[in-house]
């Protein structure tokens, strides 16, 4: 056969669907690999062909579109399962071709089992909402295209295993779930179960979102350096180990890049001849505020090291901060003034 542009296995699209539920999977060619859409391709005389490789097999085989009740069907660029079965797991390929042109891509599909409390190996999207903000809505995700707008499905929301009824600050409103003045106790997995009729059968869609309540933008600050500070003097004798922690608090800021670093006499540790070790640790509060600690240590400090200027620096999207450590030689009466 003619050469085919093979985009390989698109592992970026690790599609997971629940067992015994409908699933509609769009051919990724038109979303990520080709510049034109299905309608344009179809009107140009190109045909979309589907096939698959079962889990733990190497043999590519055509998809059986003649199953009872049209369990698997294709509609335009969408492959439909009504519903899925566990053994539908495998790598699926969609190929667009005519006599002179061919392009194909494969993607993995995993059919996942769930228990009665919606626990499963499914990876859930995380939705971050700001603590104490007025109202925050989440919408039952990935249900578009499953039923026409004329169909009004029933929607039931759960937190964990518990149906959301008379929750004080969480209100189900059809496809939406509203949170009023959210608190950390609102953290958790929220599941919507959408039930809709089709051709005399009832289908269920289960979708889970992990809610994480985080610090509010109104509370966002530049970094706050707890240590070093003006109250603590690192007084050492030559030959002793010098250990200075740089402990910095960063309030949660969405997509902020938090940085902590040391300078010694204005230079990065890598650019000085001193034998320095730096170890970093990070801890998080319940609202994802971050405390980042960088411990600078010199195993055997020299008199020269005790005269150097050690400055802790921190930066986030709100600003920068810096603080010098007070280092002096034991028995030496004077403390070198630190110039910032």
């Amino acid at each position: 056969s003619e050469r085919c542009d093979d985009w390989g296995l698109d592992t970026m699209r690790q599609i997971q669907v629940f067992e015994d539920e409908p699933a509609r999977i769009k051919c990724p060619l038109f979303e990520h690999f080709l510049k034109y859409n299905y309608s344009t391709a179809h009107s140009s005389g190109l045909t979309l062909i589907w096939y698959w490789t079962r889990q733990d097999r190497d043999l590519e085989e055509p998809i059986n579109f003649r199953l009872p009740e049209n369990r698997i069907s294709k509609e335009k660029d969408v492959l439909w399962f009504r519903p899925t079965l566990l053994n539908d797991t495998g790598n699926y390929t969609c190929m667009l071709r005519n006599t002179t042109y061919c392009s194909k891509v494969a993607f993995p599909l995993e059919v996942v089992q769930k228990d009665s409390c919606f626990n499963s190996a499914m990876r859930f999207p995380v939705h971050k909402m700001y603590i104490e903000h007025g109202i925050h809505k989440i919408t039952c995700p990935n249900v578009d295209g499953y039923f026409p707008s004329s169909v009004k499905p029933s929607v039931t929301w759960y937190k964990g295993c518990t149906e959301i009824v008379d929750f004080h600050n969480v209100l189900p409103e059809g496809m939406n779930l509203s949170f009023f003045i959210p608190l950390v106790s609102n953290n958790g997995n929220y599941t919507c179960v959408v039930t809709y009729p089709e051709n005399g059968r009832l289908f269920h869609l289960t979708r889970t979102v992990t809610v994480k309540v985080v610090g509010s933008p109104k509370d966002a600050l530049p970094p706050q350096i707890y240590s070093p500070n003006d109250r603590v003097v690192y007084e050492k004798e030559p030959g002793e180990e010098l250990v200075i922690p740089c402990k910095v608090y960063f309030s949660f800021i969405m997509d902020s890049h938090n940085e902590v670093w040391w300078t010694i006499d204005g230079k990065k540790p890598d650019d000085v001849t001193v034998d320095i070790t730096i170890n970093e640790s990070v801890s998080y509060s319940s609202t994802e505020d971050e405390t980042r600690t960088q411990i600078l240590s010199i195993k055997k400090v020299t008199p020269e090291d005790l005269r150097r200027n050690y400055v802790c620096h921190a930066r986030n999207t709100k600003g920068e901060a810096e603080q010098a450590a007070k280092v002096k030689q034991k028995g030496n009466g004077c403390t070198e003034p630190m110039t910032l």
């Epitope: 104490e132 903000h133 007025g134 003045i181 608190l183 950390v184 109104k218």
Partner: antibody
Framework: EVQLLESGGGLVQPGGSLRLSCAAS????????MTWVRQAPGKGLEWVSA????????LYADSVKGRFTISRDNSKNTLYLQMNSLRAEDTAVYYC???????????WGQGTLVTVSS | EIVMTQSPATLSVSPGERATLSCRAS??????LAWYQQKPGQAPRLLIY???TRATGIPARFSGSGSGTEFTLTISSLQSEDFAVYYC?????????FGQGTKVEIK
């Protein structure tokens, strides 16, 4: 200095209405959630209602839901509680308080007495 | 809603003695618990938040401990101005709820 000053209390007949106000000063009002707490004579404290700092989110105790409305005007640094369909059991001193999740109700007003009686 | 239960209802203590007040939540409130002091004719005053952090201006003789469902407020050496009613409050879940109060009176 943070100050909260309630007003608008008084004697009202059952079924009547009253509007309480709470004037705030000494802090950036628009940055804080606010709440109303009441205390019936000789009894304990009961949370009544809360409003988010932006005024969009409101919550109510079941005992007042549908009858009371909390609101705020950040341009006037003022919190309100509109009380309708008042009942004898609503008789209490009403306090406004500032709240944050991290520190609970950290500042309180001195309270205003609402008496519902015929 | 979370029910907060305080004990004892009344505590009789001599000045200079230690007072220990208990508060129990019907379900875990993590460390989201506050203690308030209220004197007759006055508004409540925040003493402790986060179960153990003293509010601004609160003397060191007041200390809080506990997490989850069991909490304690300790007044190490009672002063005359400490005789009042003390309330615990959870602010982990809406609605935020108070205990019924413990009255600390002079023995």
């Amino acid at each position: 200095e943070v100050q909260l000053l309630e007003s608008g209390g008084g004697l009202v007949q059952p079924g009547g209405s009253l509007r309480l106000s709470c004037a705030a000063s000494g802090f950036t009002f628009s940055q804080f959630g606010m709440t109303w707490v009441r205390q019936a004579p000789g009894k304990g404290l009961e949370w009544v209602s809360a409003i988010s700092y932006d005024g969009e989110g409101t919550l109510y105790a079941d005992s007042v839901k549908g009858r009371f409305t909390i609101s705020r005007d950040n341009s006037k640094n003022t919190l309100y509680l509109q009380m309708n369909s008042l009942r004898a059991e609503d008789t209490a001193v009403y306090y406004c308080a500032r709240f944050r999740y991290y520190t609970a109700f950290d500042y309180w007003g001195q309270g205003t007495l609402v008496t519902v009686s015929s | 809603e979370i029910v907060m239960t305080q004990s004892p209802a009344t505590l009789s203590v001599s000045p200079g003695e230690r007072a220990t007040l208990s508060c129990r939540a019907s379900q875990s409130v993590s460390s989201n618990l506050a203690w308030y002091q209220q004197k007759p004719g006055q508004a409540p005053r925040l003493l402790i938040y986060g179960a153990s952090t003293r509010a601004t201006g609160i003397p060191a003789r007041f200390s809080g401990s506990g997490s989850g469902t069991e909490f304690t407020l300790t007044i190490s050496s009672l002063q005359s101005e400490d005789f009042a009613v003390y309330y615990c409050q959870q602010y982990n879940n809406w609605p935020w709820t108070f205990g019924q109060g413990t009255k600390v009176e002079i023995k």
